[in-house]
């Protein structure tokens, strides 16, 4: 906490400029008007303030806006955002995607911090749902963002937003999350033709039920083994040998290398040996 002291003669700041880097913390506290700071926040990031000087500037804003900063200030926080606590951020009302982008840019290249997680949570809750533009933005900065959400939170994603999802965005999703996302993807891509549909739906198939896998097996999709290994075991078990052969196409030979791993292992054990022998892969049920 900086002591309240009078500003020395001639040092009162008339604007936020580089001369302030030479001010001691107590001088910043005494000589910089909080309202001036709020209107010139965009300049702060162009000036090499030390971390402790930034603490003083934050303190001045906190005093000016005890109920939370207005968005006009938030949008220009820049590196000062890194000084904010989740408690500070919970007081904010962030509605502009531009503000969100500006603050995510500050944290770019780092893991998602508690501050960023709180900011995103406030933003999404304010919007009521995870729309396409927001999802586009969030997955661009944090490819794993989608998979960090609970199934309940994912249920607020409208099918139209699924178009923004890239395969890598789903890399860390677990089956419960894919169970929620798959029906949305199916709805989003329903008007696409066979091959294009498969390219889009492929990343979501970890949430597909048996009947959809059966339908895909009729469409010459040539699913790769990596995708097959991510399918739900309970969805794979009822498939016949012929259906799996059609589903995988030329990739069916890969079953041999995966025969000890789920879901292949469990599927093999459910099949008649005669049927497995038709594959000519030496699989033992």
């Amino acid at each position: 906490e900086v002591e309240k002291t009078a500003c020395p003669s001639g040092k009162k700041a008339r604007e936020i400029d580089e001369s302030l880097i030479f001010y001691k913390k107590w001088e910043l506290e005494a000589c910089v008007d909080a309202a001036l700071l709020a209107t010139q926040m965009d300049r702060v990031n162009a000036i090499p303030f030390t971390y402790e000087q930034l603490d003083v500037l934050k303190h001045k804003l906190d005093e000016l806006y005890p109920q939370g900063y207005p968005e006009s200030v938030i949008q220009h926080l820049g590196y000062l955002f890194l000084k904010m606590s989740p408690e500070d951020i919970r007081k904010w009302n962030v509605t502009s995607l531009e503000t969100l982008k500006a603050l995510l840019e500050v944290n770019k290249g780092h893991e998602m911090s508690p501050q960023v997680a709180t900011l995103i949570d406030r933003f999404v809750k304010g919007r009521g749902q995870l729309d396409k533009d927001t999802l586009d933005t969030l997955t661009a900065f944090y490819p794993g963002y989608l998979c960090s959400l609970s199934p309940e939170e994912l249920s607020s994603v409208p099918p139209s937003s699924i178009w923004a999802v890239r395969p890598q965005d789903l890399d860390t999703c677990d089956p419960r999350q894919l169970d929620v996302l798959y029906p949305k993807a199916r709805l989003a891509f329903q008007n696409m033709n066979g091959s294009e549909y498969f390219v889009k739906i492929q990343s979501f198939l970890g949430g597909a039920p048996t009947e959809d896998l059966k339908a895909l097996s009729q469409q010459n999709v040539s699913m790769d083994l990596a995708t097959f290994m991510k399918l739900r075991t309970d969805a794979v078990l009822p498939l016949t040998v012929a259906e799996v052969q059609k589903l995988l196409g030329p990739h069916v030979e890969g079953l041999k290398a995966e025969e000890r791993h789920r879901p292949v292992r469990d599927w093999i054990l459910r099949q008649r040996q005669d049927d497995l022998d038709t594959l000519g892969l030496g699989l033992q049920g």
Partner: nanobody, 122 residues
Amino acid sequence: QVQLVESGGGVVQPGRSLRLSCAASGTIFGYQYMGWVRQAPGKEREFVAAISYGSITYYYADSVKGRFTISRDNSKNTLYLQMNSLRAEDTAVYYCAAILDGDGWDGGYNYWGQGTLVTVSS
């Protein structure tokens, strides 16, 4: 004790270029910025340029933007200031600084060089 030694100053005509160097006698740990500050005769000190730790962010005073470039060579422990299109008003003593102290650039634990004089005159 780390020392900063500036070099490269001198007399130069307007419109010409000069490159200042600042060599550190040892590795400076934990600095937040390395930068250049200048002081013209009878005037206040003025920030010129700075570079943050890890060369993540570059800062320039409005008066030198587009003309001066700050850089550093970690392998040589040296900071540079490339000054192009020099003007008479750039005449000053240029100081190199390593900012470690949280209490501003005038904090007690920062390192400063002795300065090198740049005179821009026809």
